[in-house]
């Protein structure tokens, strides 16, 4: 009976996500058969989050909207380890919007999910950010410095990275 009600709960939770994600890839967390963590297929997973590389070229605002339609946000990068994971799936000749912007052009950078902006955990290329007109952040590859962040005009279309919390069922 317990297993039955657990299965029913799982199914209803899966139905919730079905509108965004017709298929999920789930893995067993730990030793308990009852704890599963899932990411939409073909998203990738790292720690407690799922990531999707959107190859469509859109403005920052449209990219964020695109992520939110899928129940996600443009990516918020919290650690070097997280960035190192993300870049494994990126193409060196492309740039990708992050969930980081400076809406008023005052050098007051903010993350889309309101995570406090911490200057000590940023990975700007050297000399970046450097322009009051460039209010959105991308991650891109520079031969001299590998992967890092750069500020650019928000309306210039780029690829993007979406991030959402893992789905636990």
């Amino acid at each position: 009976n317990f297993m039955y009600s657990k299965t029913v709960k799982r199914l209803s939770k899966l139905r919730e996500y079905q509108q965004y994600h017709p298929s999920l890839t789930c893995v067993m967390e730990g030793k308990d058969i009852e704890d599963w963590s899932c990411c939409p297929t073909p998203w990738t997973s790292f720690q407690s989050s799922c990531y999707f590389i959107s190859t469509g070229m859109q403005s920052w605002t449209k990219s964020q909207k695109n992520c939110s339609v899928m129940g996600a946000d443009l990516v918020v990068i919290n650690t070097r380890e997280e960035q190192d994971f993300i870049i494994q799936n990126l193409k060196r000749n492309s740039s990708y919007f992050l969930g980081l912007s400076d809406p008023g052009g005052r050098r007051h950078w903010q993350w889309v999910d309101q995570t406090p902006y911490n200057e000590n955990v940023t990975f700007w290329h050297s000399g970046e950010p450097n322009n009051l007109d460039e209010r959105c952040a991308i991650i891109n590859f520079r031969s001299s410095e590998e992967w890092g962040w750069n500020d650019i005009h928000c309306h210039v279309p780029q690829k993007s990275i979406c991030k959402m919390k893992k789905i636990y069922i």
Epitope: G104, G105, R106, R107, G127, N130, N131, L132, D133, H153, H155
Partner: antibody, heavy 118, light 107 residues
Framework: QVQLQQSGAELVRPGVSVKISCKGS????????MHWVKQSHAKSLEWIGV????????NYNQKFKGKATMTVDKSSTTAYMELARLTSEDSAIYYC???????????WGQGTSVTVSS | DIQMTQSTSSLSASLGDRVTITCQAS??????LNWYQQKPDGTVKLLIY???RLHTGVPSRFSGSGSGTDYSLTISNLDQEDIATYYC?????????FGGGTKLEIK
Amino acid sequence: QVQLQQSGAELVRPGVSVKISCKGSGYTFTDYSMHWVKQSHAKSLEWIGVISTYYGDSNYNQKFKGKATMTVDKSSTTAYMELARLTSEDSAIYYCARNGNFYVMDYWGQGTSVTVSS
Amino acid sequence: DIQMTQSTSSLSASLGDRVTITCQASQDISNYLNWYQQKPDGTVKLLIYYTSRLHTGVPSRFSGSGSGTDYSLTISNLDQEDIATYYCQQGNTLPWTFGGGTKLEIK
């Protein structure tokens, strides 16, 4: 080539307002914000503020809030600055300057002289 | 606001001389230091940005250096057309601020 053409010299009475203009050409106007700078004998160069030619929002030096109002007209690729309630302290040369990379003003207008005198 | 100090307000030098103009910020400005030249007719031009990068079309006799709070502009071979007033400006923090200027004259 990049050019910023400012309006001509103004001689105005105390208490009135004046609006000076800066027409940008030779580049994509909305890709670069416009700064305004005051030069008076007493104070060397002072940054008044900057207006985004794309978004239309602006950042002012606290000292010039209430004194200066910056606007843009995208269709004519012109930036404007209005100075209100003029006093002799406002007599100066005013420059517009284009925003550039590395927090710099990369091209400047020729300056507009404003003289406040009764 | 960040204060920018150009301790020398005027400087006299001979043609061909090497001239150095200094600028000090009241706090670290992370190399966001720019130099402008204002000719006697009022024309203002950007010379150097981000401490040491030469703006388009600026002769290579101009160079910049510095870090933290202390910066300098050097003209290596003074030319007649360099007669002007030179201003430093910090772009690290709004409001942007300028030094008081250094007027360069020929001996």
